[in-house]
């Protein structure tokens, strides 16, 4: 707590300006009117106040707004935002995307601070869902934001928001997260034509089922090996050699380099060696000619 002392004659602040950096803490407390500070918050950021001086300014705002700051003040907090505690932020009602952006800018390039984590939580809960503009903003500052949500949380993301997702935003997602995001992406991009659709859906294909991969194989998409290697093993296994050849197009030659890795390894084991030989890549490990293939999973389902 800063002691209440009278403001020395002639030192009463008429506006928030550089002269205040020479004020002692007690002088700031005594000579700066909280209401003036609130209306001129946008100036605080341009003035090189010390951390101690910022503490005093925060204290003044806390006294003026014990129930939480109004958004007009929050939007201009700048570096004073880093002085806020999560408890302070929980009192706020931030509804403007511009306010969110302004505060995220303060922390840009750094790991998420407790303040930012609380702010984002409050903002998203206030909106009710992760809409496109919010997701766009969050991933601009935190590219891994989407992949930091659980599959359950991702299920409440509306398909329209998927338009805001860039390939790098999915880099750290695990297969279960992609399982949830893929159907949303499929719905979001359904009205696009073949080649445009493939460009957009490509990053999400780690969640695609077999039927969709079969459909893509009919569209001359020329999937690259990096994308193929991220597909679900269970979705790749039922594909025929002809379908994989069509799916990969000129990239099919890359299968040789990946023959020991999933899902290629497991897929090879399911194919007839005769069929594999038609690729002319020297892939080995397929089912020898004359062997009968029993689908045990089908047998179990029937019994």
């Amino acid at each position: 707590e800063v002691e209440k002392t009278a403001c020395p004659s002639g030192k009463k602040a008429r506006e928030i300006d550089e002269s205040l950096i020479f004020y002692k803490k007690w002088e700031l407390e005594a000579c700066v009117d909280a209401a003036l500070l609130a209306t001129q918050m946008d100036r605080v950021n341009a003035i090189p106040f010390t951390y101690e001086q910022l503490d005093v300014l925060k204290h003044k705002l806390d006294e003026l707004y014990p129930q939480g700051y109004p958004e007009s003040v929050i939007q201009h907090l700048g570096y004073l935002f880093l002085k806020m505690s999560p408890e302070d932020i929980r009192k706020w009602n931030v509804t403007s995307l511009e306010t969110l952006k302004a505060l995220l800018e303060v922390n840009k390039g750094h790991e998420m601070s407790p303040q930012v984590a609380t702010l984002i939580d409050r903002f998203v809960k206030g909106r009710g869902q992760l809409d496109k503009d919010t997701l766009d903003t969050l991933t601009a500052f935190y590219p891994g934001y989407l992949c930091s949500l659980s599959p359950e949380e991702l299920s409440s993301v509306p398909p329209s928001s998927i338009w805001a997702v860039r390939p790098q935003d999915l880099d750290t997602c695990d297969p279960r997260q992609l399982d949830v995001l893929y159907p949303k992406a499929r719905l979001a991009f359904q009205n696009m034509n073949g080649s445009e659709y493939f460009v957009k859906i490509q990053s999400f294909l780690g969640g695609a089922p077999t039927e969709d991969l079969k459909a893509l194989s009919q569209q001359n998409v020329s999937m690259d090996l990096a994308t193929f290697m991220k597909l679900r093993t269970d979705a790749v296994l039922p594909l025929t050699v002809a379908e994989v050849q069509k799916l990969l197009g000129p990239h099919v030659e890359g299968l040789k380099a990946e023959e020991r890795h999933r899902p290629v390894r497991d897929w090879i084991l399911r194919q007839r060696q005769d069929d594999l030989d038609t690729l002319g890549l020297g892939l080995q490990g397929g089912i020898p000619n004359g062997y009968l293939v029993l689908d045990l999973s089908m047998q179990e389902a029937l019994s």
Partner: nanobody, 115 residues
Framework: QVQLVESGGGLVQAGGSLRLSCAAS????????MRWYRQAQGKQREWVAS???????SYSDPVQGRFTISRDNARNTVYLQMNSLRPADTAVYYC?????????WGQGTQVTVSS
């Protein structure tokens, strides 16, 4: 800066169990996803399991029902309980911490399952 240190690997007979630990040091806030990956000799690194900020979990098909991921927030540690181990589970197991901005990796711990 976040650092991750795995432990608990070793040699075990097929059918046996192991419990891997991953201790995180350094501060991170916001949503955190802890994941285990593994990499067998000459193979690509593959995802094993995840535990999300909400506490919910998910597993890859090969380990579903045999492995359990859990965490102790007080100790900043995530665990992977591995039961009914198979020779195919032999690999270096890596711990990964994903935040909204970064992805951090541990050095890995070797798990060998003999038949």
């Amino acid at each position: 800066q976040v650092q991750l240190v795995e432990s608990g690997g070793g040699l075990v007979q097929a059918g046996g169990s192991l419990r891997l630990s991953c201790a995180a040091s350094g501060s991170t806030f916001g949503r955190i996803v802890m994941r285990w990956y593994r990499q067998a000799q000459g193979k690509q690194r593959e995802w094993v399991a995840s535990i999300y900020d909400s506490g919910s979990t998910s597993y890859s098909d090969p380990v579903q029902g045999r492995f359990t991921i859990s965490r102790d927030n007080a100790r900043n540690t995530v665990y992977l309980q591995m039961n009914s181990l198979r020779p195919a589970d032999t690999a270096v197991y890596y711990c990964n911490l994903g935040t909204a901005l970064s992805s951090y990796w541990g050095q890995g711990t070797q798990v060998t399952v003999s038949s």
